[in-house]
């Protein structure tokens, strides 16, 4: 009679994580008598996966009833596959012996490959806000995928970015892999509503890539522009001066009025108006009693935006020349106004 052969018909089996893997094994003869065992790997360090004779293998079931007479099907199923299960599995026939069974013949092995989906990409931006024209870095990370082949793309508002670097780790063989990418993005004043998107495509996703997003509103700081103007006279001796704070983001802003360098009033931006581009405008006004001043008054609107050094704009209010004409539009020009930036 021809000597028993152990046949593992499948050279390789591909299974998605979470599914069940079926590993086929058939013997060509019932002789010699003895059990079948399944191992992952070969040599002395091999791992026992299933023993027909004894032991508890909760994830393993046999495809057929091994207690049936004349059964030569020793195929097994391994449930709830994870990337850690990848490897080469050997079906090994043992010959009944005393005191121990003796290894008789092994199959050629079946390589189990596990496909695992990448985790949802996580995009993170810089720790501190940056202003327009500056370049900022965004990182994207995704983990736990297999096989190693993966594609990552970056987009800003739907436009693909080209300035990025990507690494897939580890470089060698592994049960699963991670991807890390860093993209450089140049900010513009219109980026409050912008989004940066990291898109990951992998064989397990069947053409439906995963996306991670970051809102540039978390990253950008648009500094305000200031304009101080003198309004028409309210009463005989009062002048209304306004400070227009325009196009700033985020909203956190504190304004201080100074009269000849002395703090007159401090307030926090509250009822702001929002522009289409997501930036804000705000206006503060100061009522100056001209009769209380003998000399010209230097009014300064000083703004501290988002914890940054204050910026200011000044307006010189002439009180000696023509007090009656102060409210006229001609006299309300920003005579002698200047801008002071304090850094």
């Amino acid at each position: 009679e021809e000597e028993l052969q152990v046949i593992q018909p499948d050279k390789s089996v591909l299974v998605a994580a979470g599914e069940t893997a079926t590993l086929r094994c058939t013997a060509t003869s019932l002789i010699p008598v003895g059990p079948i065992q399944w191992f992952r790997g070969a040599g002395p360090g091999r791992e026992l996966i299933y023993n027909q004779k004894e032991g508890h293998f909760p994830r393993v079931t046999t495809v057929s009833d091994l207690t049936k007479r004349n059964n030569m099907d020793f195929s097994i199923r391994i449930g709830n596959i994870t990337p850690a299960d990848a490897g080469t599995y050997y079906c090994v026939k043992f010959r009944k012996g005393s005191p121990d069974d003796v290894e008789f013949k092994s199959g050629a092995g079946t390589e189990l490959s596990v496909r695992a989906k990448p985790s949802a990409p996580v995009v993170s931006g810089p720790a501190a806000r940056a202003t327009p024209q500056h370049t900022v870095s965004f990182t994207c990370e995704s983990h736990g995928f297999s096989p190693r082949d993966i594609t990552l793309k970056w987009f800003k508002n739907g436009n693909e970015l080209s300035d990025f670097q990507t690494n897939v780790d580890p470089v060698g063989e592994s049960v699963s892999y991670s991807i890390h990418s860093t993209a450089k993005v140049v900010l513009t004043r219109e980026d409050v509503h912008s989004q940066v998107i990291c898109e990951v495509a992998h064989v397990t996703l069947q053409g439906d890539p995963l996306r991670g997003t970051a809102n540039l509103s978390e990253t950008i700081r648009v500094p305000p522009t200031l304009e101080v103007t003198q309004q028409p006279v309210r009463a005989e001796n009062q002048v209304n001066v306004t400070c227009q704070v325009r196009k700033f983001y985020p909203q956190r802003l504190q304004l201080t009025w100074l009269e000849n360098g002395n703090v007159s009033r401090t307030e926090t931006a509250s009822t702001v108006t929002e522009n289409k581009d997501g930036t804000y405008n705000w206006m503060s006004w100061l009522l100056v009693n001209v009769s209380a001043h003998r000399d010209d008054v230097k009014l300064t609107c000083q703004v501290e935006h988002d914890g940054q050094p204050a910026v200011s704009k000044s307006h010189d209010l002439k009180v000696s020349a023509h007090p009656k004409e102060q409210g006229s539009n001609t006299a309300a020009e920003n005579t002698g106004s200047n801008e002071r930036n304090i850094y």
Epitope: P9, K11, S12, V13, L14, T26, S64, K68, M72, A108
Partner: antibody, heavy 121, light 112 residues
Framework: QVQLVQSGAEVKKPGASVKVSCKAS????????IFWMRQAPGQGLEWMGW????????DYAQKFQGRVTMTMDTSISTAYMELSRLRSDDTAVYYC??????????????WGQGTLVTVSS | DIVMTQSPLSLPVTPGEPASISCRSS???????????LDWYLQKPGQSPQLLIY???NRASGVPDRFSGSGSGTDFTLKISRVEAEDVGVYCC?????????FGQGTKVEIK
């Protein structure tokens, strides 16, 4: 000589089931796996699963799990493939094939003539 | 799954002339044992599919020697040295390396 003879064409309504038979002759039925494949119009062949007539063991492609059942009757050397909850995209020619294995490789050395299953309301 | 891509999908041939069909796989079919796990099948009009070539280049029993398979890794070719009228039908490649087995779309060979 080795032959695999399949049952005739079927027309089914969506939601129904179909059972295709594959009668083997000319060899020891229990000595070879029977695989089932299908080919939809204008498409390539698609692997559905197998049955081992020696043990009754089966394995189904993930796509068909829960809808397909492969059985056999060794007394008449026949394998069966039943597909339930039929949809219009199950319209295809269904084939059985014998898998022949050496210690190195396995191939489908004999095929049935195919059974056309049309799913239409 | 391994994706198999055949070209051309249609091949008009002249009897007596050579013909060749290409099959590409999305990953290598070369096993560490040195064998390429690729089969070629032919389905003649009105007939069951039949095995022509296994392990990339081995002719199945009863297959005429005008059929030959070559290639390795991801690129494979089936050649017919001199086409005969009886060779018409749909030729299909299949990767036999990995379960699930996957097939090419098929190449229809017909006489001009």
């Amino acid at each position: 000589q080795v032959q695999l003879v399949q049952s005739g064409a079927e027309v089914k309504k969506p939601g129904a089931s179909v059972k295709v038979s594959c009668k083997a002759s000319g060899y020891t039925f229990t000595g070879y796996y029977i695989f089932w494949m299908r080919q939809a119009p204008g498409q390539g062949l698609e692997w559905m699963g197998w049955i081992n007539p020696n043990s009754g063991g089966t394995d189904y492609a993930q796509k068909f799990q829960g809808r397909v059942t492969m059985t056999m009757d060794t007394s008449i050397s026949t394998a069966y493939m039943e597909l339930s909850r039929l949809r219009s995209d199950d319209t295809a020619v269904y084939y059985c094939a014998r898998e022949d294995c050496t210690s190195i490789s396995c191939s489908f050395d004999y095929w049935g003539q195919g059974t056309l299953v049309t799913v239409s309301s | 799954d391994i994706v198999m891509t055949q070209s051309p999908l249609s091949l008009p041939v002249t009897p007596g002339e050579p013909a060749s069909i290409s099959c590409r796989s999305s990953q290598s079919l070369l096993h560490s044992n040195g064998y390429n796990y690729l089969d070629w099948y032919l389905q003649k009009p009105g007939q069951s599919p039949q095995l022509l070539i296994y392990l990339g280049s081995n002719r199945a029993s009863g297959v005429p020697d005008r059929f030959s398979g070559s290639g390795s890794g991801t690129d494979f070719t089936l050649k017919i040295s001199r086409v005969e009228a009886e060779d018409v039908g749909v030729y299909c490649c299949m990767q036999a390396l990995q379960t699930p087995r996957t097939f090419g779309q098929g190449t229809k060979v017909e006489i001009k």
